[in-house]
């Protein structure tokens, strides 16, 4: 029996009945075995077919078989109800081999020409399966010449059988206090040949509770306990399961903070699996009772491990742990069922005793010594000599624990000295002057330090003077001996002050004229203001209206008198302001250099002479009365003049203070 071509030879060719295209003889039996490469099949079709027709093709026939299976028994020329002729049909081997058998019996009623057939090997598409048959691959099938291979979706791995996709379902760790886990693909059928391990791992102190939910369907067996697929639950204490079948297992209270769930499946079956909802519990902490005037947040039915609460106090109350203030308070429940911090108190805010007000006093309005939330106090300044700056002095104890003014300020009010007060009445008839009485010039300052000079008190810790009077001490401020509150130059009864710093105008050049002859002395302590020590006012913007030509100013000091000696008693003189051009002209003739009198100076005195300031008065104030405010202000600073004080046709020259208000204000605010 011819075998026909065999792989690896090219697998294609022609088969024909003996004697074709002539008639075939009786009693013939021919067999061909065709073999294709692995992964290939054989295709066969007939181009001619003419065999004796007989019932069930018992006489003459062509039989096609593949392995043990008969694919077709063929006879006749055309098919009938019980016999089959190939016609235009194509026949395929089931595997890679095809057997063809031709047989004729002992007789033919008429001549038959037999058959002619062609065959060829072709690739099997293993990925195509007949309806109702199991698919070749679990997930993806890929055909190629001579074979096929399977692959899996993400999250799966190809089993060693090369067809099944096992789930990659191990190593998942659940650390939240509650959650859900399920079999792979749930509620669709779970994968075959898989071994899944899930871990629930909570902090020590928690206990995991497992609830099976929705549906449960794991392959089972009527007699044996879960031999195919099963679910097991393991804790450090015990094992639960195996579970299979269609009944939802009962709740499992594991009494453990760690749980391992194992799910194993075999190669067969079509079941939907399972779903677990897990929760956890722990030993509850005592229910937190809010302190008076406070509340707990969040409010829960119970508080277990890791739960926390915060305490918030009502407005006007603060968190205190004993005497210690807290901005916030949060307690956390511990595994032993205790809170990690003790409950604080919500105590009424206490602003404490108010600070003392220099040169002022404080009065408790709400009640004696009451300093708690919403309490009111009233600051006031010592009458006559001090006035309160900016606010009304009313302070309230606010929720932040600070005494706060109606303007929202937390700093103390300031008692500012009242300036420009004098016991002197204006008018009345130093050089050519008269003796001052107590309280006439309470701003008068005596400056000793090498020479005798004067100054005027500003506020309660500054002295305004002439630059030339303190120039030598500018780097040694402590050398200045500053005295105030006395009329007698040599009296032992005076208020002593010391200098902290000397500020000389940057435009002043010593020994080169007297332009910018102005200086400020900062005192190292504030002086107490009284009827004998009161600051002079600085000129207002409108002050020029009180300093026109012929307006009377008053100069005071202990300078040289007509006798040629320093005055023992404070002297003063009332002198008119001199027209600026007139004064400029008076000092343009020798021995005075041109430009001696500048726009930063003003002149005062009588054309006839006799009334003037003199050496020793330097730095003192030339003051004017502001008739609107009824306060005295400094218009000029004793600066220079003719060699002979009170000389006719010559005038006293004073630094024009109004030109220096920005400079004064800047220094005082900066230092």
């Amino acid at each position: 029996t011819p075998l026909g071509p065999k792989w690896p030879e090219p697998v294609f060719g022609r088969l024909a009945s003996p004697g074709f295209p002539g008639e075939y003889a009786n009693d013939q039996e021919r067999r061909w075995t065709l073999t294709a490469p692995p992964g290939y099949r054989l295709r066969l079709y007939f181009t001619h077919f003419d065999l004796e027709l007989s019932h069930l093709c018992e006489y003459d026939f062509v039989k096609l078989s593949s392995g043990a299976k008969v694919l077709a028994t063929l006879c006749g020329q055309e098919s009938t109800d019980t016999e089959r002729a190939p016609g235009k049909d194509t026949f395929y081997s089931l595997g890679s081999s095809l057997d063809i058998t031709f047989r004729s019996d002992y007789s033919n009623e008429k001549p038959f020409t037999g058959f002619e057939a062609f065959y060829a090997a072709e690739d099997i598409d293993e990925c195509q399966v007949a309806p109702g048959e199991a698919p070749t691959c679990d997930h993806h099938c890929h055909n190629h010449l001579g074979g096929f291979y399977c692959s899996c979706r993400a999250g799966y791995v190809l089993h060693r059988n090369k067809r099944t996709c096992s789930a990659l379902c191990s190593g998942q760790v659940f650390t939240q206090r509650s959650g859900e886990l399920s079999s792979p693909e749930y509620p669709r059928p779970y994968p075959k040949l898989s071994s899944c391990t899930y871990s629930i791992s909570l902090e020590e102190g928690f206990s995991v509770i497992l609830d099976f939910v929705e549906s449960f369907d794991v392959e089972t067996h009527p007699e044996t306990l879960c031999p195919y697929d099963f679910l097991k639950i393991q804790t450090d204490r015990e094992e639960h399961g195996p579970f299979c079948g269609k009944t939802l297992p009962h709740r499992i209270e594991t009494k453990s903070n760690t749980v391992t769930i194992t799910f194993v499946t075999d190669e067969s079956g079509d079941h939907t699996g399972w779903k677990i909802h897990y929760t956890s519990t722990a030993q509850p902490c005592p229910y937190p009772m809010a302190p008076p005037n406070g509340h707990v947040s969040p409010v829960q039915a119970k508080y277990i491990l890791k739960d926390s609460f915060s305490i918030f106090c009502e407005t006007g109350y603060e968190l205190l742990q004993g005497h210690l203030p807290l901005k916030s308070f949060t307690a956390v429940c511990q595994k032993d069922g205790s809170w990690d911090r003790p409950m604080p108190a919500c105590s009424i805010v206490d602003c404490g005793p108010p600070d003392d007000l220099p040169s002022g006093r404080v009065e408790y309005i709400t009640g004696p010594g009451v300093t708690t939330y919403k309490a009111v106090i009233q600051y006031s300044c010592e009458e006559t000599f001090y006035t309160m700056k900016v606010n009304d002095g009313k302070y309230v104890c606010e929720a932040d624990g600070f005494w706060t003014s109606s303007k929202g300020e937390k700093s103390l009010p300031v008692c500012e000295p009242v300036c420009g007060l004098s016991a002197r009445t204006t008018g009345g008839r130093i050089y050519g002057g008269q003796k001052a009485k107590p309280g006439d010039f309470p701003w008068q300052v005596l400056i000793l330090g090498g020479t005798t000079a004067a100054g005027a008190l500003l506020y309660d810790n500054w002295v305004l003077t002439a630059a030339h009077a303190v120039y030598e001490q500018k780097h040694d401020a402590s050398a200045l001996d500053i005295r105030m509150g006395t009329l007698k130059r040599l009296s032992p009864h005076y208020t002593q002050a010391w200098s902290e710093a000397v500020f000389i105008h940057e435009g002043y050049t010593h020994d080169a004229g007297f332009d910018n002859d102005i200086a400020l002395i900062k005192l190292n302590n504030k002086v107490v203001i009284n009827s004998n020590i009161t600051p002079i006012c600085l000129p207002r913007k409108e002050a020029e209206s009180f300093m026109r030509t012929d307006d009377i100013g008053t100069a005071s000091g202990w300078g040289l008198t007509q006798r040629g000696f320093l005055a023992r008693n404070l002297m003063y003189v009332d002198i008119p302001i001199v027209d600026h051009q007139k004064c400029t002209a008076a000092y343009e003739k020798p021995p005075y250099p041109r430009g001696s009198v500048t726009a930063n100076m003003l002149c005062a005195g009588l054309e006839s002479g006799g009334k003037d300031s003199c050496r020793g008065d330097s730095g003192g104030a030339l003051v004017f009365l502001d008739s609107e405010t009824e306060r005295w202000f400094v218009g000029g600073i004793v600066s220079w003049g003719s060699m002979n004080c009170g000389e006719a046709g010559q005038y006293g020259v004073y630094t024009k203070v109004i030109n220096y208000i920005p400079w004064i204000e800047n220094i005082i605010s900066d230092f």
Partner: antibody, heavy 114, light 107 residues
């Protein structure tokens, strides 16, 4: 990690003022708590001097109230102790601490001597 | 001021022993008491706050108890590194005050 570090002169003359600085790292002094000064005299006796709270409020030991001032600089995260008119009795090791007392500085030793 | 009295200036103990350091407040201070441990040349180290709460990192052999006026620090299994001076401290009432200290020594 929260750390407190004291710094100061080491030696001060009687009647002068003492100024100490506590520099806090790892926690803002305005976030919470009371920031305290505590001193330990030779012989180990401890004395609470006062605190400045997260809000800037102060509380002082009445035995020192006329001489003590505690202030802070929130931008540099420091708080300060000023003690005026010191005497030899103020010789001690000065600690700054966050209360609830959970963090202390290493301390700085101050000697008052002429 | 509230006086915190630590009646024993010194206490002798052996490694492995259980020892209790006591402190008495002159007035009720609630639970607002802390305990500190101090070794020579070091700053006080916090052990206990609010009478019985251990600071984190403090070994559980240290236990605080008491409220009101009587307070105790117990060291259940004394180790050689526990030999130090122990101070109680009240922060209930202004001004805050400390005990004079109790020195723990080896027998």
């Amino acid at each position: 990690d929260v750390q407190l570090q004291e710094s100061g002169p080491g030696l001060v003359k009687p009647s002068q003022s003492l100024s100490l600085t506590c520099t806090v790292t790892g926690y803002s002094i305005t976030s919470d708590y009371a920031w305290n000064w505590i001193r330990q005299f030779p012989g180990n006796k401890l004395e609470w001097m006062g605190y400045i709270s997260y809000s800037g409020r102060t509380s002082y030991n009445p035995s020192l109230k006329s001489r003590i001032s505690i202030t802070r600089n929130t931008s540099t995260n420091q708080f300060f102790l000023q003690l005026n008119s010191v005497t030899t009795e103020d010789t001690a090791t000065y600690f700054c601490a966050r209360y609830w007392g959970d963090y202390w500085g290493q301390g700085t030793t101050l000697t008052v001597s002429s | 001021d509230i006086v915190m009295t630590q009646s024993q200036k010194f206490m002798s103990t052996s490694v492995g022993d259980r020892v209790s350091v006591t402190c008495k407040a002159s007035q009720n201070v609630g639970s607002n008491v802390a305990w500190f441990q101090q070794k020579p040349g070091q700053s006080p180290k916090p052990l206990i706050y609010s009478a019985s709460y251990r600071y984190s990192g403090v070994p559980d052999r240290f236990t605080g108890s008491g409220s009101g006026t009587d307070f105790t620090l117990t060291i259940s299994n004394v180790q050689s590194e526990d030999l130090a001076e122990y101070f109680c401290h009240q922060y209930n009432t202004y001004p805050l005050t400390f005990g004079a200290g109790t020195k723990l020594e080896l027998n």
